[in-house]
Amino acid sequence: VSLRIQEGCSHLPSCCPSKEQEPPEEWLKWSSASVSPPEPLSHTHHAESCRASKDGPLNSRAISPWSYELDRDLNRVPQDLYHARCLCPHCVSLQTGSHMDPLGNSVPLYHNQTVFYRRPCHGEEGTHRRYCLERRLYRVSLACVCVRPRVMA
Amino acid sequence: VSLRIQEGCSHLPSCCPSKEQEPPEEWLKWSSASVSPPEPLSHTHHAESCRASKDGPLNSRAISPWSYELDRDLNRVPQDLYHARCLCPHCVSLQTGSHMDPLGNSVPLYHNQTVFYRRPCHGEEGTHRRYCLERRLYRVSLACVCVRPRVMA
């Protein structure tokens, strides 16, 4: 199975044959991009609470801690994306690791990621055996960051 | 120009024809993913210094400020990637925005991003008119995060 850049198809970026009525295993292999978030998923309780741990993954040690939420779509490449969800409105104190400091805000860092969606190819013969890969920008929150509140001029 | 999932090529995920000796304009249109980093690039001086601003983009307001370094490869999708480079070893004080607090470390958050590389297709007829798209995981630093130092058990 391969992706072929090919002329003669109006769809950007792709039209692709597929086996009718069969889950396309090769597509799954190809499209299953990194299925882990930037930091290993932590299933311990502290990953879901507003405190900065002294161990564990970076997202739980941060003073703007966050958890990862899975966004899965099998018709997309990558199939699995992870969104960071801030666990505190303010930053956690470096001293205590638990009390919030109103001087700092914990805010998500957003990014428009390039993804590809599998779509039916319209206006082609044999549409049952074709799909198109459509490139899109998809907004994901990468992490939560401790920032000084914006001062309006 | 389109991407076609096609059998009969040993390269995962793709083999693709290209116009010989011509810059592939359609490839450029297709592959030019979001060429901006998560936050707008700031050309002001404070974006490159170890201080937390009270205005400007998120990466300069963070108490773990960072700058973006462009990583451009025209044979890759996306062509442009941005790496976060931490501007301070420690977190900046929320009070002053300039003095560093040794209680916190400013560390990069890494992520293995899915990218596609344009490669010659080996073992195929008409190789001059073909290239392959090869899926790879590519490590990028997304941002810098203020964390409590890890305490070893």
């Epitope: 069969e22 889950p23 899975l70 899965r72 994306l81 599998r118 | -």
Partner: antibody
């Protein structure tokens, strides 16, 4: 052929836990997702949660803290556990197969449903 | 979280008539599905990813729409179509399946 069958306790006392098992046949749990849906008497359908073929789970955000979905692929069984039941949890609980492929795309419809199991919360 | 609003809540039609019911989403929806539930039975998939008809569904049923506005049409209603019809959407993030409140179709 594809079949799903729910089995539950029928009656649960308030504040107690509910455990329902969905036993499937005609397909493999590693290839499909399973959704849990409930329907209070005379009311509409409410999605509770889902488990993917690889075991990843998603829950209704309102009920997340009370729900747990797990499965045993070898036994072809999916389990729903719900804590701290109240009278408004009285409903018919359904399991439904999710994710079918038509040769082009994956669809997130619930294409096969169990007959449901009735749960009454009462003292 | 996307909210699906179905209208009308109840409707009646005579055999042979054409009926249309709508499903309005609070924000744009990518995947929309329709189910039929007869009294005392489990829901049955009718339409997947509008406008595709599920296996075994009579061609008198059709689905249309995009974005925030969808509809289900029965070209010539039959007595056996008396049921409640639900629209349902799926979103990958936040990962949810959402049902509309339902439209009850009565046959005169």
């Amino acid at each position: 052929q594809v079949q799903l069958k729910e089995s539950g306790p029928g009656l649960v006392a308030p504040s107690q836990s509910l455990s329902i098992t969905c036993t499937v046949s005609g397909f493999s749990l590693t290839d499909y997702g399973i959704n849990w849906v409930r329907q209070p008497p005379g009311k509409g359908l409410e999605w509770l949660g889902m488990i993917w073929g690889d075991g990843v789970t998603h829950y209704n955000s309102v009920l997340k803290s009370r729900l747990s979905i797990s499965k045993d692929n070898s036994m072809s069984q999916i389990f729903l556990k719900m804590n701290s039941l109240q009278t408004d949890d009285t409903a018919r609980y359904y399991c439904a197969r999710t994710l079918f492929y038509d040769g082009t795309l994956y669809y997130y419809a619930m294409d096969y449903w169990g007959q449901g199991t009735s749960v009454t919360v009462s003292s | 979280q996307i909210v699906l609003t179905q209208s009308p809540a109840t409707m009646s039609a005579s055999p042979g008539e054409k009926v249309t019911m709508t499903c309005s989403a609070s924000s744009s929806v990518t995947y929309m599905y329709w189910y039929q539930q007869k009294t005392g039975s489990s829901p049955r998939l009718l339409i997947y990813d509008t406008p595709n008809l599920a296996s075994g569904v009579p061609v008198r049923f059709s689905g249309s729409g995009s974005g925030t506005s969808y509809s289900l049409t029965i070209s010539r209603v039959e007595a056996e179509d008396a049921a409640t019809y639900y629209c349902q959407q799926w979103s990958s993030y936040p990962h949810t399946w959402t049902f509309g409140g339902g439209t009850k179709l009565e046959i005169k």
